[in-house]
Interface confidence: medium
Amino acid sequence: QGHLVHMTVVSGSNVTLNISESLPENYKQLTWFYTFDQKIVEWDSRKSKYFESKFKGRVRLDPQSGALYISKVQKEDNSTYIMRVLKKTGNEQEWKIKLQVLDPVPKPVIKIEKIEDMDDNCYLKLSCVIPGESVNYTWYGDKRPFPKELQNSVLETTLMPHNYSRCYTCQVSNSVSSKNGTVCLSPPCTLARS
């Protein structure tokens, strides 16, 4: 009871919800639910019945494996999906799949908050701007990743001459996609003309 699997997919993709084990032999009934009590599809005595739901026309059940195919998933499809199987013995068994649908991240824009010579070094404050998304940030100076301590939307650092990089890249990513934005400086400490 209560097996829970997590799945993260990109919006617009086709998804297969299935379990990693074999279905009980000769089960009597199989039902997929959306958020616990809303039936999506039910297989009973060798036929499938699709219920009126937002999935109608977008789902297909494979009774052999119990897999539920959903086409063109959207963020609104985020939910816990439950497959309940009624065995010949009358016992029920259920599996849960928590589906997270994420949009691809947009391309970030790097904004120069501050750049100045400081004690013969270069003080740099860059922000990585994307529309309200929950994402991870990775900053690179040329090809070198900055340390974990600097991985948020604002890069603030003071570089000594031997550590200057020409270009700074912000990589934004979620578990389904990633995009880069880059800004280049003219050494030692000025914005390059584009």
């Epitope: 400081m118 004690d119 340390p147 974990k148 600097l150 604002v154 603030e156 650092t157 550590n163």
Partner: antibody, heavy 118, light 108 residues
């Protein structure tokens, strides 16, 4: 010349609190990340905490998380470490250090001794 | 986290001798982001080498660093009386920053 001078160490009972200070001079303090590193008597060096130049980001070693707070007053060119719920294993010389490009520590202050004992 | 192991623990040597200190990492240190510090009794550590092989400002050229990946070396070509001290390596390729346990160079 860059100078870092720590103060505020002393003897404290287990469970007690202490605030360390580090006065900085000779550089533009607000432009640099700063760190605390400690050294237990006769032992090696252990990174404790880090704060970004603006003070907007702070990071801690697992051993002190939830008990120590690093903060800074850029108008006073001073770095602080507030320590609560102190344990015997926190006994050490505490050094403040300029965190060079978030890489290595250069230079260091002379250190202040914290002793946690009943 | 990356564990750094320094060897030997102690070296007993005479002034004028050549010294080689070893620092071995439990996993590869990216881009040779390794520093060496010197610490004398009652004093703060002092940066000697960064980037595995670059000498810090004001450090005499008898100090040199080498290595990459998991094996790094600090060499003192000719020991001066003021070089007897503790030496620590530190990696800054990944978080948290970690230090080796140190090597003591003492007068024989």
């Amino acid at each position: 010349e860059v100078q870092l001078v720590e103060s505020g160490g002393g003897l404290v009972h287990p469970g007690g609190s202490l605030r360390l200070s580090c006065a900085a001079s000779g550089f533009t303090f607000g432009g640099y990340a700063m760190s605390w590193v400690r050294q237990a008597p006769g032992k090696g060096l252990e990174w404790v905490s880090l704060i970004s130049g603006s003070g907007g980001s702070t990071y801690y070693a697992d051993s002190v998380k939830g008990r120590f707070t690093i903060f800074r007053d850029n108008s006073k060119n001073t770095l602080y470490l507030q320590m609560i719920s102190l344990r015997a294993e926190d006994s050490a010389v505490y050094y403040c250090a300029k965190y060079s490009n978030y890489d290595y520590f250069d230079p260091w202050g002379q250190g202040t001794l914290v002793t946690v004992s009943s | 986290e990356i564990v750094l192991t320094q060897s030997p623990g102690t070296l007993s040597l005479s002034p004028g001798e050549r010294v080689t200190l070893s620092c071995r990492a439990s996993q590869s240190v990216s881009s040779s982001y390794l520093a060496w510090y010197q610490q004398k009794p009652g004093q703060a550590p002092r940066l000697l080498i960064y980037g595995a092989s670059s000498r810090a400002t004001g450090i005499p050229d008898r100090f040199s660093g080498s290595g990459s990946g998991t094996d790094f070396t600090l060499t003192i070509s000719r020991l001066e009386p003021e070089d007897f001290a503790m030496y620590y390596c530190q990696q800054y390729g990944s978080s948290p920053r970690t230090f080796g346990q140190g090597t003591k160079v003492e007068i024989k």
